[in-house]
Amino acid sequence: QLPPGKPEIFKCRSPNKETFTCWWRPGTDGGLPTNYSLTYHREGETLMHECPDYITGGPNSCHFGKQYTSMWRTYVMMVNATNQMGSSFSDELYVDVTYIVQPDPPLELTVEVKQPEDRKPYLWMKWSPPTLIDLKTGWFTLLYEIRLKPEKAAEWETHFAGQQTEFKILSLHPGQKYLVQVRCKPDHGYWSAWSPATFIQIPSDFIMND
């Protein structure tokens, strides 16, 4: 029976700069029941605080709700593991909410085959930003990426869409059924998960781009 091993805070993520969650990996348990606590202070403060919510983010997590989340402030946090034989502390982690944003996937992806009379046909897609993100405040610039592939293909074809929420693709294989997905990323931060796949059947008479 030993003191617990050193825990590690391995990830902090925010969906929208308004709340965030951090997760830690326990070290070895030393063969005894181990209690974990996360303490933090904001840089420039002297008072330490303890995690306000160990529940929302699941096991081994700390969730910071709106009233505990400050942009432009660096959080300094560590996890303490304690059992009957002693304690161990994680390394301090410095967290700036601005740089840990991982949005939810974009919403309402719609895909259509457009066949204008006077121009080549194309695949047109549009989507909406995730609901948790308020783009009107100017705090966010969201960038988008699209990927698509024929249903039975192994490889995805990826296109960067920049800040626009619609996109055209000209080069497609006639008669194929395609899967299309979109994801987004703030200017500083992490890519979201891909949106659920939307399927589109390309007509057999679709004319490939020269």
Partner: antibody
Framework: EVQLVESGGGLVKPGGSLRLSCAAS????????MNWVRQAPGKGLEWVSS????????HYADSVKGRFTISRDNAKNSLYLQMNSLRDEDTAVYYC???????????WGQGTLVIVSS | DIQLTQSPSFLSASVGDRVTITCWAS??????LAWYQQKPGKAPKLLIY???TLQSGVPSRFSGSGSGTEFTLTISSLQPEDFATYFC?????????FGGGTKVEIK
């Protein structure tokens, strides 16, 4: 509606002990640091002790250090103050208060009176 | 320990008056200061936190300002229900401390 209700106050002789309780309702008790604050008759407010969400951070005023012990039971939504070696100067109304770490002591109980007298 | 000095200790004023209470900290506390109102036989009530943020449900005639070592609580137009004792509190470092209080009485 947030409610904090203190109990356990009363008359005790110098050197005696009391245990105060604070029952919380209408809040996610486990998400907040909690505090005891006291007010001697006709005097100002004095912070006594604070305890963090999972009890990993505990602090006391110098005037009670070594004599008072703060604790909490999140499963019972309850805060406690064990007071030993009581002195005349501990006579006061004792309030429990929720500490919103983003703000201040935003909810207070109605208080319980502790009288230390021979 | 950080000492908080409130001025004045007593203040006589009339309904409609503009009232200012000052709280000085013995060392810098950034903006970690709160103001409370207490009426006889009642628990304190939070008015202002982080020096200038109005607590939800508190009338807008109350305002706070300052940072570092000097802070003020202002009541722009005193109402009958505002006659009470006001306390400042620092939340910058332990031990958390309160000012001595300012009693606002009817002139």
């Amino acid at each position: 509606e947030v409610q904090l209700v203190e109990s356990g106050g009363g008359l005790v002789k110098p050197g005696g002990s009391l245990r105060l309780s604070c029952a919380a309702s209408g809040i996610t008790f486990s998400s907040y640091s909690m505090n005891w604050v006291r007010q001697a008759p006709g005097k100002g407010l004095e912070w006594v002790s604070s305890i963090s969400t999972r009890s990993s951070l505990i602090h006391y005023a110098d005037s009670v250090k070594g004599r008072f012990t703060i604790s909490r039971d999140n499963a019972k939504n309850s805060l406690y103050l064990q007071m030993n070696s009581l002195r005349d100067e501990d006579t006061a109304v004792y309030y429990c208060a929720r500490w919103d770490a983003a703000a201040a002591f935003d909810y207070w109980g109605q208080g319980t009176l502790v009288i230390v007298s021979s | 320990d950080i000492q908080l000095t409130q001025s004045p200790s007593f203040l006589s004023a009339s309904v409609g008056d503009r009232v200012t209470i000052t709280c000085w900290a013995s060392q810098g506390i950034s903006s970690y200061l709160a103001w409370y109102q207490q009426k006889p036989g009642k628990a304190p009530k939070l008015l202002i936190y982080v020096a200038s943020t109005l607590q939800s449900g508190v009338p807008s005639r109350f305002s706070g300002s300052g940072s570092g070592t000097e802070f003020t609580l202002t009541i722009s137009s005193l109402q009958p229900e505002d006659f009470a004792t006001y306390f400042c509190q620092q939340l910058n470092s332990y031990p958390l401390t309160f000012g001595g209080g300012t009693k606002v009485e009817i002139k």
